[in-house]
């Protein structure tokens, strides 16, 4: 039975040109995390495998940095980076857990004068 839960940073905002950390946390289970996939809509950004380490998709390697921890750092943000991001935890023996983060990338002036979402 899958008893675990995924906690995420939820809805977050960041300035165009800046960077943001995406974090998810798996709790309430004793399952072993074998791999975490980070995806944007249907695109794979990165994989963190417990045995093999990090793999960053070639198309994102200049703007995605691994970590901290199992998280992912997005750099040089553009307005096109606005959207849904998913952390997919592959665990044994539970199976797969998925967390969702919505990122809104704002023009600098907009972010300075009251973003719709607050960074936790």
């Amino acid at each position: 039975m899958m008893t675990g839960t995924i906690e995420t940073t939820g809805n977050i905002s960041a300035e165009k040109g800046g960077s943001i950390i995406l974090q998810c946390h798996l709790s309430s289970t004793t399952a072993q995390v074998t791999q975490v996939n980070w995806e944007q809509q249907d695109q794979l950004l990165a994989i963190c495998n417990a045995d093999l380490g990090w793999h960053i998709s070639p198309s994102f390697k200049d703007r995605v940095a691994p970590g901290p921890g199992l998280g992912l750092t997005l750099q040089s943000l553009t307005v096109n980076d606005t959207g849904e991001y998913f952390c997919i935890y592959h665990t044994y023996p539970d199976g797969t857990y998925t967390g969702r983060i919505f990122l809104e990338v704002l023009e600098s002036s907009v972010a300075e004068h009251g973003a719709r979402f607050q960074i936790p």
Epitope: H25, S27, K61, A65, P66, P68, G69, L70
Partner: antibody, heavy 116, light 107 residues
Framework: QVQLQQPGAELVKPGASVKMSCKAS????????INWVKQRPGQGLEWIGD????????NYNGKFNNKATLTLDTSSSTAYMQLSSLTSEDSAVYYC?????????WGAGTTVTVSS | DILLTQSPAILSVSPGERVSFSCRAS??????IQWYQQRTNGSPRLLIK???ESISGIPSRFSGSGSGTDFTLSINSVESEDSADYYC?????????FGGGSKLEIK
Amino acid sequence: QVQLQQPGAELVKPGASVKMSCKASGYTFTTFWINWVKQRPGQGLEWIGDIFPGRGITNYNGKFNNKATLTLDTSSSTAYMQLSSLTSEDSAVYYCSRGLGYFDVWGAGTTVTVSS
Amino acid sequence: DILLTQSPAILSVSPGERVSFSCRASQSVGTSIQWYQQRTNGSPRLLIKYGFESISGIPSRFSGSGSGTDFTLSINSVESEDSADYYCQQSYRWPYTFGGGSKLEIK
């Protein structure tokens, strides 16, 4: 098996610099972070910084910004840490470790002694 | 920086007893806490990762729990070889930080 090899000891004079190595084997060097940790005699563990061999990205504990420099030689799967302007406060054991946020493999540590 | 406070500083117990160490973070770190054991003159050894995940080769008497700001390392039925220093470490944000450590002495 996965191993991190470090030289046992370095004796250096005050004001000088030292560059210590950490040679990795048994895994793909470019996919795991290499971390450096300081431990003064009888004291706790202090994280210095990390470096990601796949891209050369570094992060530092601000306390070590002007003290430590982390570099790589990916061709030999070796990470390096240089410590500059050494004082007695830098006398310590320095560990390298492999990590994904957690540090699952540790070297035996390099004991740095700063003495004239 | 995230501050990790460990307690107790020193614990002295007899073999067979159950012991617990506390690690409190200055802000929420989710489940991004690791526990390490360091015996005298040895390198640290990873015991628990991400709050509760067990590590291959580590005896099952070691377990971790907690999330947010409060974490616990428990040793069920302590053995003499468990005499060591124990450290927690957070990987929620750079710079990563360690707690000050807890010493376990076996009577």
